[in-house]
Protein backbone atom coordinates (compact mmCIF):
# COMPACT_ATOMS: atom_id res chain seq x y z
CA UNK A 1 0.00 0.00 0.00
CA UNK A 2 0.98 3.65 -0.21
CA UNK A 3 3.56 5.07 2.17
CA UNK A 4 1.80 7.45 4.56
CA UNK A 5 2.99 10.95 5.47
CA UNK A 6 1.46 13.26 8.03
CA UNK A 7 1.21 16.99 8.56
CA UNK A 8 -0.87 19.35 10.66
CA UNK A 9 -3.24 21.97 9.32
CA UNK A 10 -1.28 25.15 8.72
CA UNK A 11 2.09 23.41 8.44
CA UNK A 12 4.00 22.54 5.30
CA UNK A 13 3.76 18.93 4.12
CA UNK A 14 6.71 17.08 2.63
CA UNK A 15 6.30 14.20 0.18
CA UNK A 16 9.65 12.61 -0.72
CA UNK A 17 10.50 11.45 -4.23
CA UNK A 18 13.99 11.03 -5.67
CA UNK A 19 15.85 9.66 -8.62
CA UNK A 20 19.51 9.58 -9.54
CA UNK A 21 20.19 11.26 -12.89
CA UNK A 22 22.35 9.20 -15.24
CA UNK A 23 24.70 12.18 -15.49
CA UNK A 24 24.72 15.68 -13.97
CA UNK A 25 22.16 17.82 -15.73
CA UNK A 26 20.75 14.81 -17.58
CA UNK A 27 17.28 15.33 -16.13
CA UNK A 28 14.14 13.28 -16.53
CA UNK A 29 10.65 14.82 -16.73
CA UNK A 30 8.68 14.40 -13.52
CA UNK A 31 5.07 15.17 -12.71
CA UNK A 32 3.23 15.42 -9.43
CA UNK A 33 -0.54 15.01 -9.35
CA UNK A 34 -3.33 14.76 -6.83
CA UNK A 35 -4.77 11.27 -6.92
CA UNK A 36 -3.14 7.90 -7.58
CA UNK A 37 -0.97 7.63 -10.69
CA UNK A 38 -3.24 7.13 -13.69
CA UNK A 39 -2.66 5.26 -16.95
CA UNK A 40 -0.50 8.03 -18.40
CA UNK A 41 1.44 10.85 -16.73
CA UNK A 42 -0.32 12.45 -13.73
CA UNK A 43 -3.92 13.38 -13.17
CA UNK A 44 -4.78 16.76 -11.63
CA UNK A 45 -1.21 17.95 -12.14
CA UNK A 46 0.10 20.31 -9.46
CA UNK A 47 3.73 20.49 -10.62
CA UNK A 48 5.77 19.33 -13.58
CA UNK A 49 9.42 19.42 -14.56
CA UNK A 50 11.00 18.85 -17.95
CA UNK A 51 14.57 18.08 -18.98
CA UNK A 52 15.69 21.53 -17.83
CA UNK A 53 13.42 23.21 -15.33
CA UNK A 54 10.14 23.31 -13.45
CA UNK A 55 7.79 24.16 -16.30
CA UNK A 56 4.44 24.10 -14.50
CA UNK A 57 3.41 24.63 -10.91
CA UNK A 58 0.41 25.79 -8.95
CA UNK A 59 0.35 27.94 -5.84
CA UNK A 60 1.45 26.28 -2.58
CA UNK A 61 3.27 23.46 -4.39
CA UNK A 62 7.03 23.66 -4.86
CA UNK A 63 10.23 21.67 -5.03
CA UNK A 64 12.50 22.78 -2.24
CA UNK A 65 15.27 20.27 -2.88
CA UNK A 66 17.76 20.35 -5.71
CA UNK A 67 15.73 18.81 -8.50
CA UNK A 68 18.76 19.03 -10.79
CA UNK A 69 20.30 16.33 -8.59
CA UNK A 70 17.14 14.25 -8.66
CA UNK A 71 15.42 15.49 -5.51
CA UNK A 72 11.89 16.03 -6.76
CA UNK A 73 10.26 15.89 -3.32
CA UNK A 74 7.10 17.96 -3.14
CA UNK A 75 6.41 20.58 -0.48
CA UNK A 76 2.82 21.69 0.01
CA UNK A 77 2.60 25.00 1.80
CA UNK A 78 0.13 25.77 4.59
CA UNK A 79 -1.92 22.59 4.27
CA UNK A 80 -5.62 22.25 4.96
CA UNK A 81 -7.72 19.15 5.53
CA UNK A 82 -8.64 19.28 1.83
CA UNK A 83 -5.02 18.46 0.97
CA UNK A 84 -5.41 14.95 2.40
CA UNK A 85 -5.26 12.11 -0.07
CA UNK A 86 -2.99 10.26 -2.43
CA UNK A 87 -0.36 12.07 -4.51
CA UNK A 88 1.42 10.63 -7.52
CA UNK A 89 5.09 11.23 -8.21
CA UNK A 90 5.83 9.95 -11.71
CA UNK A 91 9.37 9.87 -13.03
CA UNK A 92 8.99 9.78 -16.78
CA UNK A 93 12.06 7.86 -17.87
CA UNK A 94 12.34 7.75 -21.66
CA UNK A 95 11.44 4.47 -23.31
CA UNK A 96 8.53 2.11 -23.29
CA UNK A 97 7.33 0.97 -19.87
CA UNK A 98 10.13 2.75 -18.06
CA UNK A 99 8.07 5.19 -15.96
CA UNK A 100 8.48 4.89 -12.22
CA UNK A 101 5.27 5.57 -10.31
CA UNK A 102 5.01 6.33 -6.60
CA UNK A 103 1.77 6.88 -4.71
CA UNK A 104 2.18 8.74 -1.42
CA UNK A 105 -0.66 9.14 1.03
CA UNK A 106 -0.88 12.46 2.84
CA UNK A 107 -2.85 12.55 6.08
CA UNK A 108 -3.63 15.99 7.45
CA UNK A 109 -4.34 16.25 11.18
CA UNK A 110 -6.19 19.16 12.75
CA UNK A 111 -3.86 21.69 14.34
CA UNK A 112 -3.25 21.18 18.04
CA UNK A 113 -5.20 23.66 20.12
CA UNK A 114 -2.82 25.63 22.35
CA UNK A 115 -3.37 28.55 24.70
CA UNK A 116 -2.98 31.90 23.00
CA UNK A 117 0.57 33.18 23.63
CA UNK A 118 1.03 36.44 25.49
CA UNK A 119 3.20 37.76 22.72
CA UNK A 120 2.32 36.68 19.20
CA UNK A 121 4.73 36.74 16.34
CA UNK A 122 4.54 35.71 12.72
CA UNK A 123 6.51 32.49 12.93
CA UNK A 124 6.82 32.08 9.16
CA UNK A 125 8.20 35.57 8.85
CA UNK A 126 10.68 34.89 11.61
CA UNK A 127 11.92 31.75 9.84
CA UNK A 128 11.19 32.13 6.14
CA UNK A 129 11.42 28.58 4.68
CA UNK A 130 14.12 27.85 7.20
CA UNK A 131 12.60 24.58 8.34
CA UNK A 132 13.14 22.84 5.03
CA UNK A 133 16.47 21.39 4.13
CA UNK A 134 18.28 21.19 0.85
CA UNK A 135 20.87 18.67 1.95
CA UNK A 136 20.54 14.95 2.50
CA UNK A 137 22.24 12.57 4.84
CA UNK A 138 22.17 11.77 8.52
CA UNK A 139 25.38 13.68 9.24
CA UNK A 140 23.84 17.01 8.32
CA UNK A 141 22.47 19.31 10.95
CA UNK A 142 20.23 22.31 10.70
CA UNK A 143 21.28 25.41 12.58
CA UNK A 144 18.89 28.07 13.66
CA UNK A 145 21.22 30.97 14.15
CA UNK A 146 20.04 33.52 16.69
CA UNK A 147 16.51 32.89 17.90
CA UNK A 148 14.08 35.78 18.16
CA UNK A 149 11.62 36.05 21.03
CA UNK A 150 9.33 33.08 20.72
CA UNK A 151 7.19 31.30 23.26
CA UNK A 152 7.44 27.71 24.46
CA UNK A 153 4.68 26.52 22.17
CA UNK A 154 6.57 27.83 19.17
CA UNK A 155 9.82 26.26 20.34
CA UNK A 156 8.02 22.93 20.74
CA UNK A 157 6.55 23.25 17.27
CA UNK A 158 9.95 24.16 15.90
CA UNK A 159 11.54 21.13 17.54
CA UNK A 160 8.85 18.87 16.12
CA UNK A 161 9.27 20.30 12.65
CA UNK A 162 13.03 19.94 12.82
CA UNK A 163 12.62 16.35 13.89
CA UNK A 164 10.15 15.70 11.05
CA UNK A 165 12.44 17.44 8.59
CA UNK A 166 15.41 15.36 9.70
CA UNK A 167 13.23 12.27 9.40
CA UNK A 168 12.40 13.36 5.88
CA UNK A 169 16.12 13.33 5.08
CA UNK A 170 16.40 9.76 6.30
CA UNK A 171 13.50 8.78 4.05
CA UNK A 172 15.83 9.12 1.10
CA UNK A 173 17.23 5.71 1.93
CA UNK A 174 13.86 4.02 2.27
CA UNK A 175 11.43 6.12 0.26
CA UNK A 176 10.70 6.73 -3.40
CA UNK A 177 14.20 6.62 -4.83
CA UNK A 178 15.37 5.17 -8.11
CA UNK A 179 18.64 5.16 -9.99
CA UNK A 180 18.77 5.89 -13.69
CA UNK A 181 21.53 4.80 -16.00
Amino acid sequence: SEVEYRAEVGQNAYLPCFYTPAAPGNLVPVCWGKGACPVFECGNVVLRTDERDVNYWTSRYWLNGDFRKGDVSLTIENVTLADSGIYCCRIQIPGIMNDEKFNLKLVIKPAKVTPAPTRQRDFTAAFPRMLTTRGHGPAETQTLGSLPDINLTQISTLANELRDSRLANDLRDSGATIRIG
Epitope: C37, V39, F40, E41, G43, I96, M97, N103
Partner: antibody, heavy 114, light 107 residues
Framework: EVQLQESGPSLVKPSQTLSLTCSVT????????WNWIRKFPGNKLEYMGY???????YYNPSLKSRISITRDTSKNQYYLQLNSVTTEDTATYYC????????WGQGTTLTVSS | DIQMTQSPSSLSASLGGKVTITCKAS??????IAWYQHKPGKGPRLLIH???TLQPGIPSRFSGSGSGTDYSFSISNLEPEDFATYYC?????????FGSGTKLEIK
Amino acid sequence: EVQLQESGPSLVKPSQTLSLTCSVTGDSITSGYWNWIRKFPGNKLEYMGYINYSGSTYYNPSLKSRISITRDTSKNQYYLQLNSVTTEDTATYYCATGNHFDYWGQGTTLTVSS
Amino acid sequence: DIQMTQSPSSLSASLGGKVTITCKASQDINKYIAWYQHKPGKGPRLLIHYTSTLQPGIPSRFSGSGSGTDYSFSISNLEPEDFATYYCLQYDNLLFTFGSGTKLEIK
Protein backbone atom coordinates in the same frame (compact mmCIF):
# COMPACT_ATOMS: atom_id res chain seq x y z
CA GLU B 1 -17.81 16.31 -21.45
CA VAL B 2 -15.53 14.56 -23.91
CA GLN B 3 -17.30 12.63 -26.66
CA LEU B 4 -15.70 10.26 -29.14
CA GLN B 5 -17.18 8.84 -32.32
CA GLU B 6 -15.60 6.13 -34.45
CA SER B 7 -16.28 5.87 -38.16
CA GLY B 8 -15.04 3.72 -41.01
CA PRO B 9 -15.95 0.76 -43.20
CA SER B 10 -17.84 -2.19 -41.79
CA LEU B 11 -16.34 -4.66 -44.25
CA VAL B 12 -12.75 -4.99 -45.46
CA LYS B 13 -11.20 -7.72 -47.60
CA PRO B 14 -8.21 -9.73 -46.36
CA SER B 15 -4.81 -8.18 -47.16
CA GLN B 16 -6.33 -4.73 -47.49
CA THR B 17 -5.72 -1.75 -45.23
CA LEU B 18 -8.22 -0.74 -42.56
CA SER B 19 -8.66 2.99 -41.91
CA LEU B 20 -10.76 4.27 -39.02
CA THR B 21 -11.44 7.79 -37.76
CA CYS B 22 -12.13 8.97 -34.22
CA SER B 23 -13.83 12.38 -34.06
CA VAL B 24 -13.44 14.16 -30.75
CA THR B 25 -15.65 16.85 -29.27
CA GLY B 26 -15.43 18.50 -25.86
CA ASP B 27 -11.64 18.39 -25.69
CA SER B 28 -8.64 19.08 -27.87
CA ILE B 29 -6.46 16.24 -29.09
CA THR B 30 -3.48 18.55 -28.49
CA SER B 31 -3.80 17.61 -24.82
CA GLY B 32 -3.93 14.14 -23.34
CA TYR B 33 -3.60 10.65 -24.77
CA TRP B 34 -5.83 9.26 -27.51
CA ASN B 35 -6.14 5.50 -27.71
CA TRP B 36 -7.45 2.67 -29.86
CA ILE B 37 -8.76 -0.52 -28.26
CA ARG B 38 -10.56 -3.39 -29.93
CA LYS B 39 -12.89 -6.15 -28.78
CA PHE B 40 -12.89 -9.49 -30.56
CA PRO B 41 -16.02 -11.61 -31.13
CA GLY B 42 -15.04 -13.83 -28.20
CA ASN B 43 -15.18 -10.72 -25.96
CA LYS B 44 -11.41 -10.35 -25.54
CA LEU B 45 -10.27 -6.72 -25.33
CA GLU B 46 -6.90 -5.70 -26.77
CA TYR B 47 -5.09 -2.40 -26.32
CA MET B 48 -3.74 -1.23 -29.69
CA GLY B 49 -1.89 2.02 -29.07
CA TYR B 50 -2.07 5.77 -28.63
CA ILE B 51 -1.17 9.13 -30.07
CA ASN B 52 -0.58 11.85 -27.48
CA TYR B 53 -0.77 15.63 -27.21
CA SER B 54 2.60 16.08 -28.90
CA GLY B 55 1.97 13.58 -31.68
CA SER B 56 4.11 10.85 -30.10
CA THR B 57 2.79 7.34 -30.64
CA TYR B 58 2.98 3.99 -28.90
CA TYR B 59 1.88 0.71 -30.47
CA ASN B 60 1.19 -2.67 -28.96
CA PRO B 61 4.26 -4.74 -29.90
CA SER B 62 2.02 -7.48 -31.29
CA LEU B 63 0.76 -5.02 -33.94
CA LYS B 64 3.84 -2.87 -34.40
CA SER B 65 4.63 -3.88 -37.98
CA ARG B 66 1.06 -3.23 -39.20
CA ILE B 67 -0.32 -0.30 -37.21
CA SER B 68 -0.15 3.46 -37.59
CA ILE B 69 -1.98 6.10 -35.54
CA THR B 70 -2.04 9.65 -36.89
CA ARG B 71 -4.02 12.82 -36.26
CA ASP B 72 -5.36 16.00 -37.82
CA THR B 73 -5.45 18.67 -35.13
CA SER B 74 -7.38 21.09 -37.36
CA LYS B 75 -10.25 18.60 -37.51
CA ASN B 76 -9.73 17.34 -33.95
CA GLN B 77 -9.63 13.81 -35.28
CA TYR B 78 -7.23 10.92 -34.95
CA TYR B 79 -6.92 7.85 -37.10
CA LEU B 80 -6.09 4.18 -37.02
CA GLN B 81 -4.53 2.44 -39.98
CA LEU B 82 -4.03 -1.33 -39.89
CA ASN B 83 -2.28 -2.94 -42.83
CA SER B 84 -2.56 -6.46 -44.24
CA VAL B 85 -5.72 -7.32 -42.34
CA THR B 86 -6.84 -10.91 -41.88
CA THR B 87 -10.04 -12.45 -40.55
CA GLU B 88 -8.36 -12.31 -37.13
CA ASP B 89 -8.81 -8.53 -37.20
CA THR B 90 -12.59 -8.86 -37.19
CA ALA B 91 -13.58 -6.90 -34.07
CA THR B 92 -15.34 -3.86 -32.67
CA TYR B 93 -12.92 -0.94 -32.64
CA TYR B 94 -13.10 1.73 -29.93
CA CYS B 95 -11.36 5.03 -29.43
CA ALA B 96 -10.88 6.07 -25.82
CA THR B 97 -9.26 8.75 -23.68
CA GLY B 98 -9.01 9.97 -20.08
CA ASN B 99 -6.83 9.27 -17.05
CA HIS B 100 -8.04 5.66 -16.86
CA PHE B 101 -9.82 5.35 -20.21
CA ASP B 102 -12.73 7.25 -18.71
CA TYR B 103 -14.30 8.10 -22.07
CA TRP B 104 -15.00 5.71 -24.96
CA GLY B 105 -16.78 5.88 -28.26
CA GLN B 106 -19.62 3.46 -28.84
CA GLY B 107 -17.46 1.41 -31.20
CA THR B 108 -17.51 0.52 -34.87
CA THR B 109 -17.77 -3.10 -35.94
CA LEU B 110 -15.43 -4.32 -38.63
CA THR B 111 -15.66 -7.61 -40.46
CA VAL B 112 -12.74 -8.88 -42.48
CA SER B 113 -14.02 -11.24 -45.14
CA SER B 114 -13.55 -11.95 -48.81
CA ASP C 1 2.98 -9.36 -21.05
CA ILE C 2 1.12 -9.46 -17.76
CA GLN C 3 -1.73 -11.95 -17.99
CA MET C 4 -5.00 -11.13 -16.22
CA THR C 5 -7.00 -14.23 -15.35
CA GLN C 6 -10.59 -13.19 -14.68
CA SER C 7 -13.19 -15.46 -13.11
CA PRO C 8 -15.87 -16.55 -13.38
CA SER C 9 -16.54 -16.10 -17.09
CA SER C 10 -20.24 -15.85 -16.34
CA LEU C 11 -22.54 -15.85 -13.37
CA SER C 12 -26.18 -15.37 -12.63
CA ALA C 13 -27.56 -13.55 -9.63
CA SER C 14 -30.82 -12.23 -8.28
CA LEU C 15 -31.90 -8.63 -7.92
CA GLY C 16 -30.81 -7.35 -4.51
CA GLY C 17 -28.06 -9.95 -4.31
CA LYS C 18 -24.30 -9.61 -4.24
CA VAL C 19 -21.64 -10.85 -6.66
CA THR C 20 -17.85 -10.90 -6.61
CA ILE C 21 -15.53 -11.13 -9.60
CA THR C 22 -11.80 -11.78 -9.30
CA CYS C 23 -8.79 -10.98 -11.44
CA LYS C 24 -5.42 -12.60 -10.85
CA ALA C 25 -2.35 -11.00 -12.42
CA SER C 26 0.64 -13.05 -13.53
CA GLN C 27 2.87 -10.67 -11.55
CA ASP C 28 2.53 -7.88 -9.00
CA ILE C 29 0.64 -4.96 -10.58
CA ASN C 30 1.01 -2.61 -7.60
CA LYS C 31 -2.75 -1.97 -7.30
CA TYR C 32 -2.89 -0.52 -10.82
CA ILE C 33 -6.15 -2.18 -11.79
CA ALA C 34 -9.37 -0.68 -13.15
CA TRP C 35 -12.83 -2.20 -13.57
CA TYR C 36 -15.25 -1.51 -16.42
CA GLN C 37 -18.88 -2.27 -17.15
CA HIS C 38 -19.77 -3.00 -20.77
CA LYS C 39 -23.19 -3.15 -22.38
CA PRO C 40 -23.92 -4.01 -26.01
CA GLY C 41 -23.77 -1.09 -28.44
CA LYS C 42 -21.94 1.16 -25.98
CA GLY C 43 -18.37 1.81 -24.98
CA PRO C 44 -17.14 0.38 -21.67
CA ARG C 45 -17.82 2.49 -18.59
CA LEU C 46 -15.09 3.07 -16.01
CA LEU C 47 -16.27 2.12 -12.51
CA ILE C 48 -13.15 1.84 -10.36
CA HIS C 49 -9.47 2.65 -10.73
CA TYR C 50 -6.39 2.07 -8.58
CA THR C 51 -8.02 -1.04 -7.07
CA SER C 52 -10.68 0.68 -5.00
CA THR C 53 -11.15 4.31 -6.06
CA LEU C 54 -14.72 4.79 -7.22
CA GLN C 55 -15.25 7.01 -10.25
CA PRO C 56 -17.40 10.09 -9.58
CA GLY C 57 -21.06 9.26 -10.08
CA ILE C 58 -20.62 5.52 -9.56
CA PRO C 59 -22.84 4.16 -6.75
CA SER C 60 -21.16 2.85 -3.61
CA ARG C 61 -22.75 -0.55 -4.30
CA PHE C 62 -19.65 -1.08 -6.44
CA SER C 63 -16.39 -1.79 -4.65
CA GLY C 64 -12.92 -3.15 -5.30
CA SER C 65 -10.07 -4.49 -3.24
CA GLY C 66 -6.81 -6.37 -3.47
CA SER C 67 -3.04 -6.01 -3.73
CA GLY C 68 -0.08 -7.77 -5.27
CA THR C 69 -1.49 -10.18 -7.82
CA ASP C 70 -4.99 -10.79 -6.44
CA TYR C 71 -7.89 -8.39 -6.93
CA SER C 72 -11.64 -8.53 -6.54
CA PHE C 73 -14.64 -6.48 -7.57
CA SER C 74 -18.04 -6.66 -5.92
CA ILE C 75 -21.53 -5.37 -6.56
CA SER C 76 -24.01 -5.48 -3.72
CA ASN C 77 -27.77 -4.90 -3.80
CA LEU C 78 -27.90 -5.73 -7.51
CA GLU C 79 -30.15 -3.57 -9.64
CA PRO C 80 -31.53 -4.30 -13.12
CA GLU C 81 -29.05 -1.96 -14.83
CA ASP C 82 -26.09 -3.86 -13.33
CA PHE C 83 -26.54 -6.87 -15.60
CA ALA C 84 -23.75 -6.50 -18.14
CA THR C 85 -20.23 -7.73 -18.87
CA TYR C 86 -17.40 -6.62 -16.54
CA TYR C 87 -13.70 -6.38 -17.31
CA CYS C 88 -10.57 -5.72 -15.31
CA LEU C 89 -7.60 -3.84 -16.78
CA GLN C 90 -4.05 -3.75 -15.47
CA TYR C 91 -2.16 -0.54 -16.19
CA ASP C 92 1.01 -1.13 -14.22
CA ASN C 93 2.91 -0.87 -17.48
CA LEU C 94 2.25 0.18 -21.06
CA LEU C 95 1.51 -3.36 -22.16
CA PHE C 96 -2.02 -2.85 -20.87
CA THR C 97 -3.95 -6.10 -20.59
CA PHE C 98 -7.61 -6.79 -19.90
CA GLY C 99 -9.26 -9.70 -18.20
CA SER C 100 -11.37 -12.00 -20.37
CA GLY C 101 -14.65 -10.59 -19.04
CA THR C 102 -17.45 -11.77 -16.77
CA LYS C 103 -21.02 -11.79 -18.06
CA LEU C 104 -23.48 -11.09 -15.26
CA GLU C 105 -27.00 -12.34 -15.95
CA ILE C 106 -30.26 -12.19 -14.03
CA LYS C 107 -31.23 -15.41 -12.26
